[in-house]
Interface confidence: low
Amino acid sequence: LEVQVPEDPVVALVGTDATLCCSFSPEPGFSLAQLNLIWQLTDTKQLVHSFAEGQDQGSAYANRTALFPDLLAQGNASLRLQRVRVADEGSFTCFVSIRDFGSAAVSLQVAAPYSKPSMTLEPNKDLRPGDTVTITCSSYRGYPEAEVFWQDGQGVPLTGNVTTSQMANEQGLFDVHSVLRVVLGANGTYSCLVRNPVLQQDAHGSVTITGQPMTFPPEA
């Protein structure tokens, strides 16, 4: 029995619903009473959802899963996962048994966009060209871990003296803090780009130093 799932991971935003597609080709005369369907976590074999003896056996996964009962007879064994969490990420296996048996695994990739970075500067007064300053770029509640890039006002990458840390909160979402130490020129703009590698989403922040005073762009 051939069971088909998408080759590419299913990407789902945290808090949204995701459909893990799985299909099979029922033979003529197929009845749901013949169908045994099991969804489970690929690595731990933990049961997620099942259908047997003509009946939906329900969710074994925090009551956040559902089948598409009206579509099962046409060979659609897809699973709906509600309110996706970071911890849901990974591989799910769809097992279908009628007379014959088949299975396939589909990967769920969870993502969450990063917030627009906030920029802080230390010290933030009495700055002169030649002073060393610390610029901190902070962006919150994204997933997976971000890639962080710094550049000057001319778009030249700044790679030296950058320290980036990422910490996961209880939900598994990351807060990223990137610190750039730089010697001030006469004036200049310093930009931070926080990239979500899954969503290909870029969040930008910048600070412009023009002698006195310094200006921070308003939040978008």
Partner: antibody, heavy 120, light 107 residues
Framework: QVQLQQSGAELARPGASVKLSCKAS????????MQWVKQRPGQGLEWIGT????????RYTQKFKGKATLTADKSSSTAYMQLSSLASEDSAVYYC?????????????WGAGTTVTVSS | DIQMTQTTSSLSASLGDRVTISCRAS??????LNWYQQKPDGTVKLLIY???RLHSGVPSRFSGSGSGTDYSLTIDNLEQEDIATYFC?????????FGGGTKLEIK
């Protein structure tokens, strides 16, 4: 910067035990499964087992049940592997490695390895 | 356990070459195939996960492909720093298992 710092080389007698350490930094230690991998001289890599520091849950490959014991100390962000009843075939480099995305079994950060030599 | 086989244990190539390293699984692993680089000093790095996804910070000259049981790692425009041993690893079912490695040398 995510890093795994492993303890130094060990020389042990047959029948003895050793305890290797792997100190994590730059990420939330309790949120990622930590693996231990064995490599005999000139050989390939062999997965020993994994521990989830958040609650101490462990998984071992059959071959290493009874040989390796994995533990973790959340307060110091350090994972440990104890190898018992050492024999010459336990002479190897042992790596700790962080598993990447939950439930996708790839290892995105590796320690430098600890060499264990068993000799009488 | 799933067996991973890298039939070529060593490979010699010239700088600038395109190099392909193969890996075969004893059963279908549904694209859960990862590649690692081990330098002569023992340092291990992840290159590619889920068959073709480039790990953060890995040069774009590395690429991966394959499906079912057959997978490959390709290095375009070989550089001196690519001299290492390359391991494949399946992540489809526990326990994760590795290939025996392919040692890449310069001609």
């Amino acid at each position: 910067q995510v890093q795994l710092q492993q303890s130094g080389a060990e020389l042990a007698r047959p029948g003895a035990s050793v305890k290797l350490s792997c100190k994590a930094s730059g990420y939330t230690f309790t949120s990622y499964w930590m693996q231990w991998v064995k490599q005999r001289p000139g050989q390939g890599l062999e997965w020993i087992g994994t521990i989830y520091p958040g609650d101490g849950d462990t998984r071992y490959t059959q071959k290493f049940k009874g040989k390796a014991t994995l533990t973790a100390d959340k307060s110091s962000s350090t994972a440990y592997m104890q190898l018992s009843s050492l024999a010459s075939e336990d002479s190897a480099v042992y790596y700790c490695a962080r598993r990447g995305i939950p439930r996708l079994w790839y290892f995105d950060v590796w320690g430098a390895g600890t060499t264990v030599t068993v000799s009488s | 356990d799933i067996q991973m086989t890298q039939t070529t244990s060593s490979l010699s190539a010239s700088l600038g070459d395109r190099v392909t390293i193969s890996c075969r699984a004893s059963q279908d692993i549904s694209n859960y195939l990862n590649w690692y680089q081990q330098k002569p000093d023992g340092t291990v790095k992840l290159l590619i996960y889920y068959t073709s996804r480039l790990h953060s910070g890995v040069p774009s000259r590395f690429s991966g492909s394959g499906s079912g049981t057959d997978y490959s790692l390709t290095i375009d425009n070989l550089e001196q720093e690519d001299i290492a041993t390359y391991f494949c690893q399946q992540g489809n079912t526990l326990p994760p298992t590795f290939g025996g490695g392919t040692k890449l040398e310069i001609k």
